[in-house]
């Protein structure tokens, strides 16, 4: 009874032996192949890992656990059947062979068997719980993986969509760039063609201008000749009239020819009694060379020799060094008297310079320099000014000290650029300086923001092109 032993037989079946007095009871129980033997150590946390398992691994292990559970279940069922069968047989045997007092032993054995069964069942339940626990964990992980996968898939889809959009945009932009490049090439070709045409046109115009200049020179010469002839004719007529009157009044027909008087400047003309504004012939100092100049006999006491006038844009002031030297234009309109004459004139005595200006709003102003002269050509007709007064600015708009004269073909300024070519006209440019009264003539409403216009900075600023200008000189002791 108390001698209860458990062992394994040679074929791997579990063997239960109960010794009670002279009787010995042996129970043979089948052992499932896939079940863990009770003697093998059981690690309860073997399947409960913290680190997530690889998906395929988890599925595989789950299948193994399911198989184990199924096998355990089958084993239990077999055990129950076996016990029932054995119990029936044993009961029959006991009823037939054993004495009544063996019943208690049998009950005890049954109880033990039931206890064993219960233990096995508890263990199986424990395994099942663990399997369920692990299954739940795996299911959660699978769910998490699934969600994560979905999220990643969504992100990938979004990114793919974004990439597609960008690719579309890129291809659109590429097309646009190519189109622009094509357009640009066409425009460049067009500009080049235009440039070539303009160059042809410019060269044509240059040749036309040269022809016109030649014609103008010829016309001027012819005009001078005609004027001289007219003057000589008038003189002859006057002489004839004098002769006629003399021959009528006296018997002695001797003609007293009037001595020809020459004037150096308009001050001398004025002092000789000619007090009307107009064009007069002046003579170079210490020379017989003559020049025509406009004399202002009214403004500020008269006697002013006009050396420059701008009023309507009728004369081109972008001229050569030689033209600025000898003078150009029409003395009754726009003209430049000539640097050589002014240099020689101001070399003889002290002169004052008055610059009279008009804007497009009806305002007038002037700058008066008490001392003025031009150096010789050798010193590039450098301007010398001193003693500024007047209403056209307290600071001189002609840079001080004076600068050399510059033209399109005679660059004597203090700029690395060529001021005369850039701003047009000949002038005493600095670099390039606050004035240029020989700049481009701009009509009204086109006269602002012009860097190359008729400029007098300290009266109207840098971008304002004036309506009219007059530069005039007179001896300081007039």
């Amino acid at each position: 009874y108390n001698n209860f032993r458990k062992s394994m037989d040679s074929i791997g079946k579990k063997q239960y032996q109960v010794q009670h007095g002279s009787c010995s009871y042996t129970f043979l129980l089948p052992e499932m192949d896939n079940c863990r033997s009770s003697s093998s150590p059981y690690v309860s946390n073997a399947v409960q890992r913290d680190a997530p398992l690889e998906y395929d691994d988890s599925v595989q292990r789950l299948q193994v656990l399911e198989n184990i559970m199924e096998n355990n279940t089958q084993w239990l069922m077999k055990l129950e059947n076996y016990i029932q069968d054995n119990m029936k047989k044993e009961m029959v045997e006991i009823q037939q062979n054993a004495v009544q007092n063996q019943t208690a032993v049998m009950i005890e054995i049954g109880t033990n068997l039931l206890n064993q069964t219960a233990e096995q069942t508890r263990k199986l339940t424990d395994v099942e719980a663990q399997v369920l626990n692990q299954t739940t964990r795996l299911e959660l992980q699978l769910l998490e993986h699934s969600l994560s996968t979905n999220k990643l898939e969504k992100q990938i889809l979004d990114q793919t969509s974004e990439i597609n959009k960008l690719q579309d945009k890129n291809s659109f932009l590429e097309k646009k760039v190519l189109a622009m490049e094509d357009k640009h090439i066409i425009q460049l070709q067009s500009i080049k063609e235009e440039k070539d045409q303009l160059q042809v046109l410019v060269s044509k115009q240059n040749s036309i201008i040269e022809e016109l200049e030649k014609k103008i020179v010829t016309a001027t010469v012819n005009n001078s000749v005609l004027q001289k002839q007219q003057h000589d004719l008038m003189e002859t007529v006057n002489n004839l009239l004098t002769m006629m009157s003399t021959s009528n009044s006296a018997k002695d027909p001797t003609v007293a020819k009037e001595e020809q008087i020459s004037f150096r400047d308009c001050a001398e003309v004025f002092k000789s009694g000619h007090t009307t504004n107009g064009i007069y012939t002046l003579t170079f100092p210490n020379s017989t060379e003559e020049i025509k100049a406009y004399c202002d006999m009214e403004a500020g006491g008269g006697g002013w020799t006009i050396i420059q006038r701008r009023e309507d844009g009728s004369v081109d002031f972008q001229r050569t060094w030689k033209e600025y030297k000898v003078g150009f234009g029409n003395p009754s309109g726009e003209y430049w008297l000539g640097n050589e004459f002014v240099s020689q004139l101001t070399n003889q005595q002290r002169y004052v310079l008055k610059i009279h200006l008009k804007d497009w709003e009806g305002n007038e102003a002037y700058s008066l320099y008490e001392h003025f002269y031009l150096s010789s050509e050798e010193l590039n007709y450098r301007i010398h000014l001193k003693g500024l007064t007047g209403t056209a600015g307290k600071i001189s708009s002609i840079s001080q000290p004076g600068n050399d004269f510059s033209t399109k073909d005679g660059d004597n300024d203090k700029c690395i650029c060529k001021c005369s070519q850039m701003l047009t006209g000949g002038w005493w440019f600095d670099a390039c300086g606050p004035s240029n009264l020989n700049g481009m003539y701009y009509p009204q409403r086109q006269n602002t923001n012009k860097f190359n216009g008729i400029k007098w900075y300290y009266w109207k600023g840098s971008g304002y092109s004036l309506k009219a200008t007059t530069m005039m000189i007179r001896p300081a002791d007039f």
């Epitope: 101001t346 070399n347 003889q348 005595q349 001392h371 050798e378 450098r382 010398h384």
Partner: nanobody, 120 residues
Framework: EVQLVESGGGLVQAGGSLRLSCAAS????????LGWFRQAPGKEREFVAA?????SSTDSAKDRFTISRDNAKNTVYLQMNSLKPEDTAVYYC????????????????WGQGTQVTVSS
């Protein structure tokens, strides 16, 4: 281009004499007025004497300084006698207008100057 080169300057005892020369190169200056100016340290440029093409002259110290010119040699001279320590300065030669003037404004060609030092 016209250039004026002065010479004849140097160190001299008070009461002594010096003759400055100014030679023009580049072109003839027979019609131009030629003048002498001087500038002492810390002072403004001062007129000394001038001579026209025809030989008319004006000076600030007639008794001591005499200006003359040789148009053939294209040269102007300044004879300085009875020199005083206050005559110490850099002496400049200048060419200007055809009219006589003491105003340096009307002289547009200048030499580099020559130092005259009068010691007491």
């Amino acid at each position: 281009e016209v250039q004026l080169v002065e010479s004849g300057g140097g160190l001299v005892q008070a009461g002594g004499s010096l003759r400055l020369s100014c030679a023009a190169s580049g072109r003839t200056i027979s019609s131009s007025v030629l003048g002498w100016f001087r500038q002492a340290p810390g002072k403004e440029r001062e007129f000394v004497a001038a001579i026209s093409g025809s030989g008319s002259s004006t000076d600030s110290a007639k008794d001591r300084f005499t200006i003359s010119r040789d148009n053939a040699k294209n040269t102007v001279y300044l004879q300085m006698n009875s020199l005083k320590p206050e005559d110490t300065a850099v002496y400049y030669c200048a060419a200007g207008r055809a009219f006589l003037t003491r105003d340096p404004f009307y002289y547009d060609i200048w030499g580099q100057g020559t130092q005259v030092t009068v010691s007491s």
